[in-house]
């Protein structure tokens, strides 16, 4: 009787099982009665992930220096090229197929995560003690001055934008 | 016990024809494709036709395609190969050979087929 | 067409040694590779199919292994029964080819 469902790795057509492509080779023909599924290797700048019965390799993927991309994985016969983008820039999407510029923390707010290649800079306002006074995609928030420690007084309060300034202590006459 | 019985060979001119068949027994004949592979006197093994189960299917390598024609009739139990435009270099022992998972798994004891003037 | 070249052509041993024929296939084939061995006056007979997978009533004297474009059949200990052509056969892809074969001969 002719087989209804097939064994993992293989595919029905013409009422028979035949072998699936390994990863890295499309299909040329189909298996016979007598012959096994006949399968080619993706040319240079192809691939295919999966066990398949695809006539057509897929193309690996154009990291676009005008889109801010460069290579980070280079693709074989079985894998996709990985894209990431250059130094400053990270992914507008899992599929990194363009970047934008990574996002800068304006004063007030500090670097909670410095961006990487896929994720933008993480910001956090600079809480009670803290300041930024930049705008910066590296930058913390930095601690007040303290004052005290230099044997001096707080002469104008800080904020999250400014630091405190400091002034020598009033002298007893 | 599976069986398979070529006749049909015999002595033919150049130009000339033959039909071959190969009766089969001993296994359900409308499920196997089957194969005709043919040996000169001391040579080895040429493969000369196949066709499948259904009978739908038929291959030929290029040196007998157009001359050689394969067929089965699966209510007869029956394969036949039909060869026209005989060569000297036809002259061989064609047997016929069921396909068992695209092996050649059961073979005939094959029929003679010599061509001289 | 992919062609199969055996080696050696002849092979002369004695009953009880082991023998080793080669079949070489001009591209891979994967382990798409049947074994056969042929008396005189005889029909050929099915050995090992799929390079390697034994077959119901054939002697576990007889091995076989390999992939891609090299492939191996051995009989651990010779019998005098063995003494025969061996043809390998691909069907990777058509046209079907076989070997020239190798005949193993008693020494």
């Known amino acids: 009787e002719p087989p209804t469902a097939c064994r993992e790795k293989q595919y029905l057509i013409n009422s028979q099982c035949c072998s699936l492509c390994q990863p890295g080779q499309k299909l040329v023909s189909d298996c016979t009665e007598f012959t096994e599924t006949e399968c080619l290797p993706c040319g240079e700048s192809e691939f295919l992930d999966t066990w398949n019965r695809e006539t057509h390799c897929h193309q690996h993927k154009y990291c676009d220096p005008n889109l801010g991309l460069r290579v980070q994985q280079k693709g074989t016969s079985e894998t996709d090229t990985i894209c990431t983008c250059e130094e400053g820039w990270h992914c507008t999407s899992e599929a990194c197929e363009s970047c934008v510029l990574h996002r800068s923390c304006s004063p007030g707010f500090g670097v909670k995560q410095i961006a990487t290649g896929v994720s933008d800079t993480i910001c956090e306002p600079c809480p009670v003690g803290f300041f930024s006074n930049v705008s910066s995609a590296f930058e913390k928030c930095h601690p007040w001055t303290s004052c005290e420690t230099k044997d001096l007084v707080v002469q104008q309060a800080g904020t999250n934008k400014t630091d405190v300034v400091c002034g020598p202590q009033d002298r007893l006459r | 016990e599976v069986q398979l019985v070529e006749s049909g060979g015999g002595l033919v001119k150049p130009g000339g024809s033959l039909r071959l068949s190969c009766a089969a027994s001993?296994?359900?004949?409308?499920?196997?494709?089957i194969s005709w592979v043919r040996q000169a006197p001391g040579k080895g093994l040429e493969w000369v036709s196949s066709?499948?189960?259904?009978?739908?299917?038929?291959y030929y390598p290029d040196n007998v395609k157009g001359r050689f024609t394969i067929s089965r009739d699966n209510a007869k139990n029956s394969l036949y190969l039909q060869m026209n435009s005989l060569r000297a270099e036809d002259t061989a022992v064609y047997y016929c050979a069921r396909a068992g998972e695209k092996a050649m798994d059961y073979w005939g004891q094959g029929t003679l087929v010599t061509v001289s003037s | 067409e992919i062609v199969l070249t055996q080696s050696p052509a002849t092979l002369s041993l004695s009953p009880g040694e082991r023998a080793t024929l080669s079949c070489r296939a001009s591209?891979?084939?994967?382990?798409?590779l049947h074994w056969y061995q042929q008396k005189p006056g005889q029909a050929p007979r099915l050995l090992i199919k799929y390079a390697s997978q034994s077959i119901s009533g054939i002697p576990a004297r007889f091995s076989g292994s390999g992939s891609g474009t090299d492939f191996t059949l051995t009989i651990s200990s010779l019998e005098p029964e063995d003494f025969a052509v061996y043809f390998c056969q691909q069907f990777s892809s058509w046209p079907l080819t076989f070997g020239g074969g190798t005949k193993v001969e008693i020494k």
């Open positions: 066709i499948s189960s259904g009978g739908d299917n038929t």
């Open positions: 001993g296994f359900t004949f409308s499920n196997y494709g």
């Open positions: 591209q891979t084939i994967n382990n798409n």
